[in-house]
């Protein structure tokens, strides 16, 4: 089940409310929404030249 | 594939309306949000409305609220822009796009991360 | 509503070049900042999501910063294809707001 703000007033933003696991808090939207996983790479070895860019796993579609 | 696909754009004369249609493939609406962005000729984005097509909830640029409305057929993947008492400030290519969410602490980090091709609607006499 | 402003509204560089575009929002924004690249007659694309994390597919050489009011976005080696149009764009609160554009044009 779906669990998020109960009304949507206007723009005043409820805090953030549990979500189920596959789902985060979108602020934006004030609602639960599917979400997909951030991933960090790990650190390139000594020597790289630049940090490697943060990415993230795609939302199940 | 993940794809987006606009339609209904036209010329229509000040005071009259018109409905875009969104069509989504490749994925389901109902699993986040969708917006309408628009682009008047030589200017920047200006976002118009969005929905949640699983909570109905929606929101609209103050330009546009009390004369548009978007909804959403979650049977037919599909989100609407319907425009009512159209200007000529309207005038513009309009998109639907797609915002993904990562989980950032629970909380979304996230952009809009596809698109559609956009229609141009002019208002004109 | 969020104001975004961009600096600078337009640039000329050479291929090679470090670029780098800057956005403030009016209030506090946390990271809920996007960057999109947009060129003519074509939709935009997201370039950079949360500030910081590159969206997939996106090349590296592009890269986003900031926190809270300031934010960077950096191609580290501009390529011929990168001449376009960016936007930033907040989503910490409704309405979602673009910053008014920066144009990349050669010099």
């Known amino acids: 089940m779906r669990r998020g703000p109960r009304s949507l007033r206007g723009r005043d933003a409820p805090a953030p409310t549990p979500c189920v696991p596959a789902e985060c808090f979108d602020l934006l939207v004030r609602h639960c929404v599917a979400c997909g996983l951030l991933r960090t790479p790990r650190p390139k070895p000594a020597g790289a030249s630049s940090p490697a860019p943060r990415t993230a796993l795609q939302p199940q579609e | 594939e993940v794809q987006l696909v606009e339609s209904g754009g036209g010329l229509v004369q000040p005071g009259g309306s018109l409905r875009l249609s969104c069509a989504a493939s490749g994925f389901s609406i109902s699993s986040n949000s969708i917006h309408w962005v628009r682009q008047a000729p030589g200017k920047g984005l200006e976002w118009v409305a969005w929905i949640t097509p699983t909570h109905g909830s929606t929101d609209y640029a103050d330009s546009v609220k009390g004369r548009f409305t978007i909804s959403a057929d979650t049977s037919k993947n599909t989100a609407y822009l319907q425009m009512n008492s159209l200007r000529a400030e309207d005038t513009a290519v309009y998109y639907c796009?797609?915002?993904?969410?990562?989980?950032?602490?629970?909380?979304?980090?996230?952009?809009?991360?596809?698109w559609g091709q956009g229609t141009l609607v002019t208002v004109s006499s | 509503d969020i104001q975004m402003t961009q600096s600078p509204s337009s640039l000329s560089a050479s291929v090679g070049d470090r670029v780098t575009i800057t956005c403030r929002a009016s209030q506090d924004v946390s990271t809920a900042v996007a960057w999109y690249q947009q060129k003519p007659g074509k939709a935009p694309k997201l370039l950079i999501y949360?500030?910081?994390f590159l969206y997939s597919g996106v090349p590296s050489r592009f890269s986003g910063s900031g926190s809270g009011t300031d934010f960077t976005l950096t191609i580290s080696s501009l390529q011929p294809e990168d001449f376009a149009t960016y936007y930033c764009?907040?989503?910490?609160?409704?309405?979602?707001?673009f910053g008014q554009g920066t144009k990349v044009e050669i010099k």
């Open positions: 764009q907040q989503s910490h609160n409704t309405p979602p707001t």
């Open positions: 796009a797609r915002r993904v969410c990562y989980n950032r602490l629970g909380v979304c980090a996230g952009g809009m991360d596809y």
């Open positions: 949360s500030a910081s």
